[in-house]
C-alpha cells in the first residue's frame, strides 16, 4: 500500500446522535474510494458515492477516518472525527477560605461534553474588572484578591464555556461576606482521659489556610457519636481549639468531627477528617464465663440508650 504524504488530518467535531457525511477530500462523487477508520475497513454500504455517511453518531464513532483510492490504495484524505456535545450551563461557585485575603471561584459542567472546552471567567466588583489568577494546580479554579474589605459593593462573576459544538454561560452575584467559608479544622485528635470512662479529650487546630485568626477569630462546632449509633451529638464552641466530651459511653469507639466558621460572617466549613477514640476502660478482671456473658449483654443494652442531653442539628442550619 502506498500512502501519500499528507498534511495533518482534518479535525472535525460532530454532535452525539447526529448524522454526518464525510467527503473524501475533493475527490469526485463517483471516484472509486475505500474508507477506513483507525486502520479497519468500513463497509461499502456506508458510502454515498465517495462520501462516508454515518448515522446516529456515538462516542465510539470518534477516530481517524481515511479514504483511499481503491485501485492504488493512495491515501486521499484523512479526518480526525471527535463526537461530543455542546456545553450545558456551567456550575459556578465562589468561596473565601482565606478571608480577608481573597476568594476563589471554581466551575464545572453538569454533564461531560467529551471534547475540549474553553472557559473564560470575568470578575466585576461594581464596574471594576478584577483579575482572576489561574490556580497552578486546578484548571477549573481561579483566585481573586480582595481590594476593599467590608465593601458593600457586590461582586459579579461570569463564566462562559465554549467548544467546537456550542457555547453557554452563567453568572453569579454576591456580597463579600456571604461566601466566607473556612476550610475544616486540621489535626483533629481525640484521646481517652485516664480513669474517666465517660470522657474524651478532643483537640484540633485552626485551618492553616485561615490567614489571621487573631483579627478574624473562628468558632467551632463539634459532633460525635459512638460508631454503633447513627445520631450525632453536637457542641458549639465560641473559642478555643479543645473540648472534653463528658457523656461518652464507656468502652465504645467514638467518631468525632469538627467544623469552623468565622465568628460573625459566612457559613460553616465542611466537617474535618474524622478522629476515632474509645474512652478509658479499666483493665479487665478475671471473670467466669457466665459472668462475662452477663456483663457483655448488659453493656450492649445500655449502649443503645441515647444520652438525655442529645442535641441534634447541623452546622449548615445554624445562623451566624
Amino acid at each position: 500500500q502506498r500512502h501519500s504524504p499528507q498534511e495533518a488530518p482534518h479535525v472535525q467535531y460532530e454532535r452525539l446522535g447526529s448524522d454526518v457525511t464525510l467527503p473524501c477530500g475533493t475527490a469526485n462523487w463517483d471516484a472509486a474510494v475505500t474508507w477506513r477508520v483507525n486502520g479497519t475497513d468500513l463497509a461499502p454500504d456506508l458510502l454515498n458515492g465517495s462520501q462516508l455517511v454515518l448515522h446516529g453518531l456515538e462516542l465510539g464513532h470518534s477516530g481517524l477516518y481515511a479514504c483511499f483510492h481503491r485501485d492504488s490504495w493512495h491515501l486521499r484524505h484523512q479526518v480526525l472525527l471527535h463526537v461530543g456535545l455542546p456545553p450545558r450551563e456551567p456550575v459556578l461557585s465562589c468561596r473565601s477560605n482565606t478571608y480577608p485575603k481573597g476568594f476563589y471561584c471554581s466551575w464545572h459542567l453538569p454533564t461531560p461534553t467529551y471534547i475540549p472546552n474553553t472557559f473564560n471567567v470575568t470578575v466585576l466588583h461594581g464596574s471594576k474588572i478584577m483579575v482572576c489568577e489561574k490556580d497552578p494546580a486546578l484548571k477549573n479554579r481561579c483566585h481573586i484578591r480582595y481590594m476593599h474589605l467590608f465593601s458593600t459593593i457586590k461582586y459579579k462573576v461570569s463564566i462562559s464555556v465554549s467548544n467546537a459544538l456550542g457555547h453557554n454561560a452563567t453568572a453569579i452575584t454576591f456580597d463579600e461576606f456571604t461566601i466566607v467559608k473556612p476550610d475544616p479544622p486540621e489535626n483533629v485528635v481525640a484521646r481517652p482521659v485516664p480513669s474517666n470512662p465517660r470522657r474524651l479529650e478532643v483537640t484540633w487546630q485552626t485551618p492553616s489556610t485561615w490567614p489571621d485568626p487573631e483579627s478574624f477569630p473562628l468558632k467551632f462546632f463539634l459532633r460525635y457519636r459512638p460508631l454503633i449509633l447513627d445520631q450525632w451529638q453536637h457542641v458549639e464552641l465560641s473559642d478555643g481549639t479543645a473540648h472534653t466530651i463528658t457523656d461518652a459511653y464507656a468502652g465504645k469507639e467514638y467518631i468525632i468531627q469538627v467544623a469552623a466558621k468565622d465568628n460573625e460572617i459566612g457559613t460553616w466549613s465542611d466537617w474535618s477528617v474524622a478522629a476515632h477514640a474509645t474512652p478509658w476502660t479499666e483493665e479487665p478482671r478475671h471473670l467466669t464465663t457466665e459472668a462475662q456473658a452477663a456483663e457483655t449483654t448488659t453493656s450492649t443494652t445500655s449502649s443503645l440508650a441515647p444520652p438525655p442531653t442529645t442535641k441534634i442539628c447541623d452546622p449548615g442550619e445554624l445562623g451566624s
Epitope: 504524504p5 467527503p23 475527490a27 469526485n28 462523487w29 493512495h74 486521499r76
Partner: antibody, heavy 120, light 108 residues
Framework: QVQLVESGGDVVQPGRSLRLSCAAS????????MHWVRQPPGKGLEWVTI????????YYADSVKGRFTISRDNSKNTVFLQMNSLRTEDTGFYYC?????????????WGQGTLVTVSS | DIQMTQSPSSLSASVGDRVTITCRAS??????LNWYQQKPGKAPKLLIY???SLQSGVPSRFSGSGSGTDFTLTISSLQPEDFATYYC??????????FGQGTRLEIK
Amino acid sequence: QVQLVESGGDVVQPGRSLRLSCAASGFTFSYYGMHWVRQPPGKGLEWVTIISFDGSQKYYADSVKGRFTISRDNSKNTVFLQMNSLRTEDTGFYYCAAQSSTWPEYFQYWGQGTLVTVSS
Amino acid sequence: DIQMTQSPSSLSASVGDRVTITCRASQSISSYLNWYQQKPGKAPKLLIYAASSLQSGVPSRFSGSGSGTDFTLTISSLQPEDFATYYCQQSYSTPPITFGQGTRLEIK
C-alpha cells in the same frame, strides 16, 4: 459534448474586484470537483483553487488565499471565482477545469479561458 | 508543497526527431504524474496520466515513463502539430496541485 465556458474577464484597477463564471454542460457537473487554473501572459500554468463536487471542501493557492473565493451552483451547472483586492500579478488567462474521477486526478475537461487584466 | 522542475525550459527540434522532456519532483510522487500539451491561445490538453498511461485519442508517438522523482515525456517522431509547450503536473499530495514551469518545443 463536454463544454466549459468561462466569462467575466475584464480590465480592472488594482484593489478592485471581479467575478468569473464557468458554465458547464455535457457531463454530470454535480459529480465533479472544479478547479480554476491561471496563466500569466507568456508564462506557465498556476493552480488557483478547487471546490469539491458538493461545495463542502475548498482549497486555495497561498498566493490568493483570503482574497479569492470559489463557489458553485449545481442547479445551474456553474462555478464562480470571486476575486477581491486584485493585484497586478493576478493578470492572466483564467481557465476552469473539471477533475477526473480516476486516480491520479488530472484536469479532464478545460474551458477556453477568460482574460483578467489588472492595471492602473 | 511539492515542487516540479522541468528541463529543458525550451528546445528546438525538427520534424521526425525523437524528443525527450524531463520532469523532476522535489520528493517522491510515486507514479502520480500527468503531462499536458498547450498550444498558443488554447487551453491545455491531457496527453499522459499516471506517468505512463496514454489518454484516449492521443497519438501513440507520445509516451511517458518514470516513477518516484524522475519522469520523462518522449515524442518518438515529431510531427508539425507537436510544436507546443508541455507541462508536467503532480497529483500525489494535493492540494496544492503543482505544475512544472513548462518546456517550449520549437521548430529548428
